[in-house]
C-alpha cells in the first residue's frame, strides 16, 4: 500500500516524535499546521535524528518532496557554514548533520528559501521558493517523556491502538508520548483505556497497572508479573513487587527505585516514594527539593573561625590576617610572620595538600563555588575600590546582597590588604573555572548584576536551551573557547557561580502567526536595557555540576546573564558536521571555526555601550529564539541571540564597535 | 536523452472524443509527474492537469472536470489524455510536459521537458 | 485564480540589445515562477525556474529576477537566436499552473 496515499504516520523515541503529514501544503502552511498541534516542522539536526526520520519517509516516490524546518531571509546567505545561511525554525542555525542535495554554489541568494526533503532515495534536502505547496511535510514533537508500548496480553482481541496528543492513531508505537491514549480491546468483551501520565514519584507511565484483560488469573505465567502475582477479587491480577523494589510503568515488572540516580548524593531503598535521598556530611538536603543537596554553610555558624572563613562546596577553610597564622586546630589564630596561612576543613574526607596530584586538585577545583566570608571585627579589604578586571570580584559586607563567587588560588593565602590589579587572560579553559592569577583569588564583584531566572514553557529535551557540553577534544587551554557554559562531571552543585539567564518575552498561543504583514500582534517584542560594558571585562563562565538540575521544573539550565558580553580572542576548534553528499550516504565533514556561528552573539551597536537595548525576538514552545515565517516585510533588525545546542565559535575582535561575523536576526523569520 | 513523444494531429466533429498519447524516454517514468497544457491558435498557454505515474494520482482544472480523463500505460511508460464533448473553442495545439523535481540542489514544480504538441482541430 | 499579465506584449529590438520583460502577479507568488521561450510551431523551453535560476544550457544572457508579484526576464545581449514569444509561469498554488499572455519579441 502506498504510505503516501494513507494517513500520516509517526515515529517516536522516549523524548520526541517525528510524524509524516503527506498533505500539500506551502511552508508556512505546514509550520502553522506542526505548531497547532504543539509542535514544529522537523529539524534533524543529528544523524541520529536523520536516521529516524529516514525510517520514516521510508522509499518514496522521486517526485515527492516534504518541508522541514529550514528556512533563509533574501540575500543571507552563508555558503561556507554548514547550513549555508539558512535557520532552523526553532530559531538557531546549530547542527551536526546536513544532507544537501548538491555542493554549495556562489550566488546574491536574491530570495527567501525553504528547505524540502526528497521522499526518495538519500532523502536529500533540496531549496526552493517557501511558497511552493510540496506534496507533504514533517512534524517533530517533544516531551517531557514517554510510556513504553503496551505488552500483548493473552485476553487481547487485538493490538493495542495508540491515539498521540497530535492526533496520529496507530498499533505501530514503540513509545507514547506523554498524553497518549491507549485502548486495549479484551477477548472476554470489555476494553481498557489507559493514559501516559506523570507519576508521583516522577516521570511518567500508564495511568493503569496490567494486566487488561481478564485471563486465567496468575497460574500461566505468573500472571506475567516479575515478582508476585495477586489475584483480586474482580478476576483481575496484579503484581506486587518484593520489598526494595517498586512496580515499574508497564505494571509488571519491578525496578529498582535507585536504578536511574534520583538523588543527587546518596538513594536508599524504601519510603512513600520507594525510596529516600540522603546528603554527605557538609551538605544538607535542598529546601525546595530533597532530591538535591546544597552546601552547608559553617562560616555561618558562630565562632567556626577564629578570624576569616571561606566556605566551599562540602567544607570549608580558615584564615588569618595579616601578622597572624592558623594553629594547628585550623580554626585559631595566633601572632606570626607576614604570610597567612589556611587549613582546610574539607568534611567531605577530600583534604588537599600540595602533594596530591594535579587531576585531583583539578576535580576539587572545579567543586569550589563558595564565598569569602568575613570574621567580624576584621577589615581586610577597602570596599570602595573594587580591582578592574573581568571577574571583578570583592569580598561580602554586611550592606552587600550581590551574589559572591570567588575562586581561590589552591595554594596560596588570600591578600590580606586590597590586592593589585592582577593579569587577566582573555583566554579561558572549558574544563575548568577560571582562575585568574597565579598568585592571588579573585574576589566577589562590586557590579555582578542580578540572576534572572528564565522563564519557559515546558520544553522537550530536543528543544530547550541545554548546557553547551564542553565535548571538545583535549586542548591546551588556549585553545578552548571563552564564551561557554561547562557541563562538568558528577559533583555537588551548590553555591554554583552566577547563572546566564535571559528572560524570554511572552509567548505566542500556537494558533497564533506573528510579524505576517497581513497580521499585526501588539506586544510581542520585548526591549531588553543591557548594562554598560565595563572596561577590560573578561567573559563570565558559567561552570555546571553535571548533576545541576533547573532551578525550576520547566527552567532550561542554560541561562543567559542579561549583560553584555565582550569578545574575547581564541583560537577556535572545529565543529565536526556530519554531511550526507550526493557521492556518500553519510561523511564527516569537518568545518573550520570561521564557518560557525557565534557562541554568545550579543551585539555591539557603533555606539556608545551604555542603554543599550536589544530587541529579543518572541519564542514560542519548543523553541529557542524562533521565527515566524513569513513572505515580506521589513529590513533587518539586530537582536540578541542565545547558543544552542553544540559549542560554536566566539567572534574574534576584543569590544569591536560593529561586528561583521554577527548573525542579522529579520523579524520576517520564522 | 528524455524525450516525449506525442501522437499525430487529430480532426474531430463537435460532441465527439479524442484520445492522444504521450510516450516517454529516456528517464524512470514514475518519478516524474505528467501534465497537460494546451495553447489556443494565438492564445496563452493554459493548464488541463496532471497525472502521478507514481501513484496514477490525477488533478484536473476545473474548468475541464467532467470533460478530461487522464490515464497511462506504466508498461509502456505512456501517458493518455481524452477530452469528451469537444467544442470548436478546443481546437489546439495538446502538449504533454514533464514536471521538473529538482534542478542543481533546487526543487522547482516548472516543466522541464515538453512533447511536439498534437493538434486537435475541432470542425463540423 | 491567480492572474499574470506581461508587459509588453509586443516588443522590436535589434541584435546587441538589452531587453526586459516584466510580468506581473495579482498576488504573491513568492518565487514559484519560471520562464519559457516559444518559437513559431514548437514547444516552449524553459530558461528560467524559480524566478532567478538559469536553467540547465541556458545562455548566461538570461536572467531572471524578483519575488512576490513583480518578475523580469532580461536579456543582456540579444542574440538572432532570441527572436520568439516569452511566456511567464507561476506554480505557486500548484498543481494550479497558470501563465502570462506572452511577449513577442521581434527583430526591429
Known amino acids: 500500500q502506498d504510505p503516501w496515499a494513507a494517513e500520516p504516520r509517526s515515529a517516536c523515541g522516549p523524548s520526541s516524535c517525528y510524524a509524516l503529514f503527506p498533505r500539500r501544503r506551502t511552508f508556512l502552511e505546514a509550520w502553522r499546521a506542526c505548531r497547532e498541534l504543539g509542535g514544529d516542522l522537523a529539524t534533524p539536526r543529528t544523524p541520529e535524528e536523520a536516521q529516524r526520520v529516514d525510517n520514516l519517509v521510508g522509499a518514496g516516490p522521486a517526485s515527492r518532496l516534504l518541508w522541514i524546518g529550514l528556512q533563509r531571509q533574501a540575500r543571507q546567505c552563508q555558503l561556507q557554514r554548514p547550513l549555508r545561511g539558512f535557520t532552523w525554525t526553532t530559531g538557531d542555525q546549530d547542527t551536526a548533520f546536513t544532507n544537501w542535495a548538491q555542493p554549495a554554489t556562489g550566488g546574491p541568494c536574491p530570495a527567501q528559501r525553504c528547505v524540502a526533503l526528497e521522499a526518495s532515495g538519500e532523502h536529500r534536502w533540496l531549496e526552493g521558493s517557501c511558497t511552493l505547496a510540496v506534496d507533504g511535510y514533517l512534524c517533530q514533537f517533544g516531551f517531557e517523556g514517554a510510556c513504553p508500548a503496551l505488552q500483548d496480553e493473552a485476553g487481547q482481541a487485538g493490538p493495542a491502538v495508540y491515539t498521540t496528543p497530535f492526533h496520529l492513531v496507530s498499533t505501530e508505537f514503540e513509545w507514547l508520548p506523554f498524553g497518549s491514549v491507549a485502548a486495549v480491546q479484551c477477548q472476554a468483551g470489555r476494553g481498557a483505556s489507559l493514559l501516559c501520565v506523570k507519576q508521583p514519584e516522577g516521570g511518567v507511565g500508564w495511568s493503569r497497572a496490567g494486566p487488561l484483560c481478564l485471563g486465567a488469573g496468575c497460574s500461566p505465567d505468573n500472571g506475567g508479573c516479575e515478582h508476585e502475582c495477586v489475584e483480586e477479587v474482580d478476576g483481575h491480577v496484579s503484581c506486587r513487587c518484593t520489598e526494595g523494589f517498586r512496580l515499574a510503568a508497564d505494571g509488571r515488572s519491578c525496578e529498582d527505585p535507585c536504578a536511574q540516580a534520583p538523588c543527587e548524593q546518596q538513594c536508599e531503598p524504601g519510603g512513600p516514594q520507594g525510596y529516600s535521598c540522603h546528603c554527605r556530611l557538609g551538605f544538607r538536603p535542598a529546601e525546595d527539593d530533597p532530591h538535591r543537596c546544597v552546601d552547608t554553610d559553617e562560616c555561618q555558624i558562630a565562632g567556626v573561625c577564629q578570624q576569616m572563613c571561606v566556605n566551599y562546596v562540602g567544607g570549608f577553610e580558615c584564615y588569618c590576617s595579616e601578622g597572624h597564622e592558623l594553629e594547628a586546630d585550623g580554626i585559631s589564630c595566633s601572632p606570626a610572620g607576614a604570610m597567612g596561612a589556611r587549613a582546610s576543613q574539607d568534611l567531605g574526607d577530600e583534604l588537599l595538600d600540595d602533594g596530591e596530584d594535579e587531576e585531583d586538585e583539578d576535580e576539587a577545583w572545579e567543586a569550589f563555588g563558595g564565598g569569602w566570608t568575613e570574621m567580624p571585627g576584621i577589615l581586610w579589604m577597602e570596599p570602595t575600590q573594587p580591582p578592574d578586571f573581568a571577574l571583578a570580584y570583592r569580598p561580602s559586607f554586611p550592606e552587600d546582597r550581590e551574589p559572591q563567587i570567588p575562586y581561590p588560588e589552591p595554594t596560596w593565602p588570600p591578600p590580606l590588604s586590597a590586592p593589585r590589579v592582577p593579569y587577566h587572560s582573555s583566554v579561558l579553559s572549558v574544563t575548568r573555572p577560571v582562575v585568574v592569577s597565579a598568585t592571588r583569588p579573585t574576589l566577589p564583584s562590586a557590579h555582578q548584576p542580578p540572576v534572572i531566572p528564565a522563564t519557559h514553557p515546558a520544553l522537550s529535551r530536543d528543544h530547550q536551551i541545554p548546557v553547551i557540553a564542553a565535548n571538545y577534544p583535549d586542548l591546551p587551554s588556549a585553545y578552548q573557547p571563552g564564551i561557554l557554559s561547562v557541563s562538568h562531571p558528577a559533583q555537588p552543585p551548590a553555591h554554583q557561580p552566577p547563572m546566564i539567564s535571559t528572560r524570554y518575552p511572552e509567548l505566542f498561543p500556537a494558533h497564533q502567526s506573528p510579524m505576517f504583514p497581513d497580521t499585526q500582534v501588539a506586544g510581542t517584542q520585548t526591549t531588553t536595557h543591557l548594562p554598560a560594558i565595563p572596561p577590560n571585562r573578561a567573559p563570565l563562565v558559567t561552570t555546571l555540576g553535571a548533576h545541576q538540575p533547573p532551578q525550576a521544573p520547566d527552567a532550561p539550565v542554560l541561562r543567559t546573564q542579561a549583560t553584555q558580553l565582550p569578545i574575547i580572542p581564541t583560537a577556535q576548534p572545529s565543529l565536526t558536521t556530519s554531511s550526507r553528499s550526493p557521492v556518500s550516504p553519510a561523511h564527516q565533514v569537518s568545518v573550520p571555526a570561521a564557518t560557525q556561528p557565534p557562541a554568545l552573539p550579543t551585539l555591539l551597536p557603533s555606539q556608545s555601550p551604555t542603554n543599550q537595548t536589544s530587541p529579543i525576538s518572541p519564542t514560542h514552545p519548543h523553541s529557542k529564539v524562533p521565527q515566524i515565517p513569513r513572505e515580506d516585510g521589513p529590513s533587518p533588525k539586530l537582536a540578541l541571540w542565545l547558543p544552542s545546542a553544540a559549542p560554536t565559535a566566539a567572534p574574534t575582535a576584543l569590544g569591536e564597535a560593529s561586528l561583521a561575523e554577527h548573525i542579522q536576526r529579520d523579524d520576517r523569520w520564522l | 536523452q528524455v524525450q516525449l513523444v506525442q501522437s499525430g494531429p487529430e480532426v474531430k466533429k463537435p460532441g465527439a472524443s479524442v484520445k492522444m498519447s504521450c510516450k516517454a524516454s529516456?528517464?524512470?517514468?514514475?518519478?516524474?509527474?505528467i501534465h497537460w497544457v494546451r495553447q489556443g491558435p494565438g492564445q496563452r498557454l493554459e493548464w488541463m492537469g496532471y497525472i502521478n505515474p507514481y501513484d496514477d494520482d490525477t488533478t484536473y482544472n476545473q474548468k475541464f472536470k467532467g470533460r478530461v480523463t487522464m490515464t497511462l500505460d506504466k508498461s509502456a511508460s505512456t501517458a493518455y489524455m481524452q477530452l469528451n464533448s469537444l467544442r470548436s473553442e478546443d481546437t489546439a495545439v495538446y502538449y504533454c510536459?514533464?514536471?521538473?523535481?529538482?534542478?542543481?540542489?533546487?526543487?522547482?514544480?516548472?516543466?522541464?521537458?515538453w512533447g511536439q504538441g498534437t493538434l486537435v482541430t475541432v470542425s463540423s | 485564480d491567480i492572474q499574470l499579465t506581461q508587459s509588453p506584449n509586443f516588443l522590436s529590438a535589434s541584435v546587441g540589445d538589452r531587453v526586459t520583460i516584466t510580468c506581473r502577479a495579482s498576488?504573491?507568488?513568492?518565487?514559484?515562477v519560471a520562464w519559457y521561450q516559444q518559437k513559431p510551431g514548437k514547444a516552449p523551453k524553459l530558461l528560467i525556474y524559480s524566478a532567478s535560476n538559469r536553467y540547465t544550457g541556458v545562455p548566461s544572457r538570461f536572467s531572471g529576477s524578483g519575488s512576490g508579484t513583480d518578475f523580469t526576464l532580461t536579456i543582456s545581449s540579444l542574440q538572432p537566436e532570441d527572436f520568439a514569444t516569452y511566456y511567464c509561469q507561476q506554480y505557486t498554488n500548484y498543481p494550479m499552473y497558470t501563465f502570462g499572455q506572452g511577449t513577442k519579441l521581434e527583430i526591429k
Open positions: 498576488q504573491n507568488v513568492g518565487t514559484a
Open positions: 510536459a514533464r514536471r521538473g523535481n529538482s534542478y542543481d540542489g533546487y526543487f522547482d514544480y516548472s516543466m522541464d521537458y
Open positions: 529516456g528517464y524512470t517514468f514514475t518519478d516524474y509527474v
